[in-house]
């Protein structure tokens, strides 16, 4: 009878064991274990009847198609075999064991005691068959194994071979190299590779196989295993395989598909090909006069590009348009995309106008072409070139007028300051009385007229100021403050301010320049109680033209000490002392209550301590601060009552040889003007130089040299 065994281990004994087995007996044990295991059989006891070639009693071990062993007897002889210590190993997961005894036994035989167990098959070691073994890596586990692939490869659906994903290769460059995967190492199995060469229309792809060509083939059948096919439009070239590379292929197409197929076996090194684009040839090129062509080649083909450029100082001219370079291209029909342009000398054209300046040409015929030279100069004596620039500009290769220091920027003509068109009188002789000023003696003098038309009746008053530049007037803050507010400082509205420059005689305003205000800027810390920081600026609506009667005064250097005691300074004014005079009377009628002609007075600077003491000795809150200085005579007699508020107190600066505004007429009192020991108080301008430059939007370094010269 047959016994089916399915356990992973077990014991088999002869019938009746350990007693003697019966005669004429036959038992078969079929052992089946799971796939991935084999069966190991060994005997602990064996005692059967001996016979030649085990004809009588025996134990036979077999698989489905193979006898693994036949055992009988007690000990091994030449013609019979006992298992002894031998282990029987099945090749697969099945083993059949048959015990047979014949009809007679001369002795009592005890039979056998056998054991079996399932043991793991190490498929990775034992698979010799290429068809079954792993392509790259094999991993054994109890009861089975699995395969894996090297980096860049994918396990095929057969779970054994390693393929690559190579169906998405696009080549658009005009030349390139294409190889089988992993070349020159053996190419992967079970792969379908697709390479597309897609060039611009007009190109034709030429293919050339190189180096090694090794694709699995067959002696009789053409390329049944692995192969290359080349598809050009509807036409297919190939298949190609073996060890002989195809001849160079001229596809006559800009689009080519290369298919490479490998099956699941074989170890071949693969292939490599280079491709290049071919196109139509274009005619030879001649560079233009004063120009060159890059790159310079013997031949040019479709898609080749050349850049036409000109020598320094020349520009490419194409269809009347100037450019730095011009590119032309070889077209697919073998013609150039454009004619070669010409090279034209660079022209900087007419140089830019210089405000308050003029231009002279150094080159004959007023040439404005490359390397021509011009010279800018300022309208002297009213303007001077900033930083003493040479003013020389050369026409550059870029087509712009260039100066060595300023580059393409134009020079700046700054108003000359503190240089009247006629000399101010010598300060050696002390003049006690005020006197008429000659025209042009105080060209910075400004008459400021404020007419507040927003009130009924209209409020109107006057003050003086000093021209600092073509656009800015310096004056006292109290001149531009609206007195209808006492607890706060409110500047007058710019619409209510008119400035007169170049005015000499108030009866004749025809020669004067009048300007509206664009901005009124009071010092933010101006104090109406003690007139500390009594300084302000008016920006004019338009810059005024400078000339002999309109020129700026210089600002001082930043010096907290201010003007030195006993220095003589000049103050000018029209002496508008009658508060009931109207603007029309001032500007037109020349009422007798004021001086028609600009007056000036010479006054010495008073030591600060002396002035402070003189005011402290009076009853009242008079405060001579560090932002003020005093001028006048101890004995009185002359003062700036006749000079308008905000007017400039100027001192001649020996270093720069210019007149500098050191003070602004601010306040005085309480006794009548010109009283004994009543000094006029002036805003110390040198304390505000930075503030003034900041308001005017000019860095100090720009204008400082005016005074430093």
């Amino acid at each position: 009878h047959t016994v089916e065994l399915n356990n992973m281990f077990g014991q088999i004994q002869s019938p009746g064991y350990p007693d003697s087995y019966p005669s004429d007996s036959e038992v078969t044990w079929n052992i089946t274990v799971p796939d991935g295991f084999r069966i190991k059989l060994y005997f602990m006891h064996f005692n059967l009847e001996s016979s030649y070639l085990c004809e009588y009693d025996y134990v036979k071990v077999e698989t489905e198609d193979q006898v693994l062993a036949t055992f009988c007897g007690r000990e091994t002889t030449d013609t019979e075999q006992t298992p002894g210590q031998e282990v029987v190993l099945s090749p697969g997961s099945f083993m059949s064991i048959t015990f047979r005894s014949d009809f007679s036994n001369e002795e009592r035989f005890t039979g056998f005691d056998a054991h079996y167990m399932a043991v793991d098959v190490d498929e990775c070691k034992e698979r010799e068959d290429e068809e079954l073994s792993c392509d790259h890596y094999c991993h054994n586990y109890i009861g089975g194994y699995y395969c894996s692939c090297r980096f860049g490869y994918i396990l095929h659906t057969d779970n054994r071979t390693c393929r690559v994903e190579c169906s998405d290769n696009l080549f658009t460059q005009r030349t390139g190299v294409i190889t089988s995967p992993d070349f020159p190492n053996p190419y992967p199995k079970s792969s379908e590779c697709l390479y597309t060469i897609e060039l611009e229309e007009g190109f034709m792809v030429n293919l050339q196989f190189e180096d090694i060509f090794d694709i699995e083939d067959h002696p009789e059948v053409p390329c049944p295993y692995d192969y290359i096919k080349i598809k050009v439009g509807p036409k297919v070239l190939g298949p190609f395989c073996g060890e002989k590379a195809p001849e160079p292929i001229s596809t006559q197409s800009h689009s080519v598909l290369i298919l490479f197929h490998s099956d699941n076996s074989g170890e071949n090194r693969g292939w490599r090909l280079s491709y290049r684009a071919a196109g139509n040839e274009c005619p030879e090129l001649q560079p233009p006069v004063h120009g060159k062509i890059e790159p310079s080649q013997a031949k040019y083909f479709f898609k080749d590009q050349v850049l036409v450029s000109c020598d320094t100082g020349y520009k490419v001219l194409k269809d009347n348009v100037e450019m730095d370079t011009f590119q032309i291209e070889c077209l697919k029909d073998g013609t150039w995309s454009n004619k070669i342009p010409t090279c034209k000398i660079v022209d900087c054209r007419a140089p830019g106008e210089l405000e308050h300046g003029l231009i002279t040409f150094s080159t004959r015929n007023n040439l404005t072409t490359y390397k021509s030279e011009i010279k800018y100069s300022c309208q002297e004596p009213y303007y001077k070139m900033l930083n003493n620039n040479t003013g020389i500009y050369t026409c550059s290769a870029q087509g712009v007028w260039m100066n060595k220091v300023l580059g393409r920027s134009l020079p700046t003509c700054l108003p000359e300051c503190g240089q009247p068109s006629r000399s101010l009188p010598s300060l050696v002789k002390r003049i006690i009385g005020g006197r008429n000023a000659e025209p042009g003696l105080f060209p910075w003098q400004a008459l400021i007229v404020v007419e507040d038309t927003s009130r009924v009746p209209n409020d109107k008053w006057f003050g003086s100021g000093a021209l600092l530049s073509a656009s800015w007037i310096l004056t006292a803050a109290h001149v531009l403050r609206s007195q209808r507010r006492d607890t706060t400082v409110i500047p007058v509205s710019k619409e209510h301010v008119t400035v007169y420059l170049g005015l000499h005689d108030v009866r004749d305003k025809s020669g004067a320049v009048n300007s509206s205000a664009a901005r009124v800027v009071l010092h933010p810390d101006f104090n109406i109680q003690n007139y500390n920081h009594d300084i302000a600026l008016v920006q004019l609506q338009e810059p005024v033209p400078l000339g002999p009667h309109v020129m700026p005064v210089c600002l001082p250097r930043l010096e907290p000490e201010g003007p030195a005691p006993h220095m003589l300074g000049l103050v000018a004014g029209w002496g508008i002392s009658n508060p009931n005079v109207t603007v029309d009377e001032i500007i037109s009628s020349g009422t007798r209550t004021l001086s028609d002609v600009l007056q000036y007075v010479k006054l010495p600077v008073v030591p600060h301590a002396e002035c402070k003491t003189s005011y402290e000795s009076r009853s009242g809150n008079y405060s001579v601060t560090e932002n003020m200085f005093c001028a006048g005579y101890y004995e009185g007699g002359k003062d700036t009552c006749l000079g308008d508020s905000g007017g400039a107190f100027v001192i001649f600066d020996d270093l720069s040889q210019r007149w500098v505004v050191q003070g602004l007429v601010s306040w005085g009192g309480p006794e009548e003007c010109g009283s004994k020991q009543v000094y006029g108080v002036y805003t110390k301008v040198s304390n505000y130089v930075d503030w003034v430059w900041e308001q005017m939007g000019l860095p100090q370094s720009v204008v400082e040299p005016q005074v430093e010269r």
Epitope: V450, D459, W461, Q483, R484, D486, T488, I528, Q529, Y622
Partner: antibody, heavy 116, light 112 residues
Framework: QIQLVQSGSELKKPGASVKVSCKAS????????MSWVRQAPGKGLKWMGW????????TYADDFKGRFVFSLDTSVRTPYLQISSLKAEDTAVYFC?????????WGQGTLVTVSS | DVLMTQTPLSLSVTPGQPASISCKSS???????????LNWLLQRPGQSPKRLIY???KLDSGVPDRFSGSGSGTDFTLKISRVEAEDVGVYYC?????????FGQGTKVEIK
Amino acid sequence: QIQLVQSGSELKKPGASVKVSCKASGYIFTSYGMSWVRQAPGKGLKWMGWINTYSGVPTYADDFKGRFVFSLDTSVRTPYLQISSLKAEDTAVYFCARGGEAMDYWGQGTLVTVSS
Amino acid sequence: DVLMTQTPLSLSVTPGQPASISCKSSQSLLDSEGKTYLNWLLQRPGQSPKRLIYLVSKLDSGVPDRFSGSGSGTDFTLKISRVEAEDVGVYYCWQGTHFPWTFGQGTKVEIK
């Protein structure tokens, strides 16, 4: 110290004129305007107007236009109030006060009596 | 003209007690420059007026800090935290925002 010293009391007949002065000291005179304020007997204060001490331009409240004139003598730091064609209802104390709108310091007042 | 209305018109206060005077204007006193020109003054019996407060809440120098001003727009208040004998007199508010400047009718403060 800041002081506003007004002229003394006046007794005037109807139709006459009067000029009240207000001498200022202790500060920069042209820095502040000068206001004039009337106080009728037993009544409250009424602002008459002000004069800009820098420009000399006066501004009058509507009730004080015509017979009332503000003026200045800057050299002696003195504003003046002149009333012409006096009427009995002009009887009042007239104050000067420093400032157009500030009125931070006041004179001691001048009593003007109009009586026949 | 801007009408200034003070309340109460008279006030009798025990020394050491607080006092409060209200002043209302017929239109806002905030001017185009963002300032409010509302002031308070005291006229003691037989004397000329003396300004106490300007720009609503700023105290003039020499004015005791028991005085304080507050308000905005059209409603303003003068407060005395502890009234003293020297505080008697007539208190006026006035505005300097809209021409012509106008005074309140006055509030008479007496000591009980």
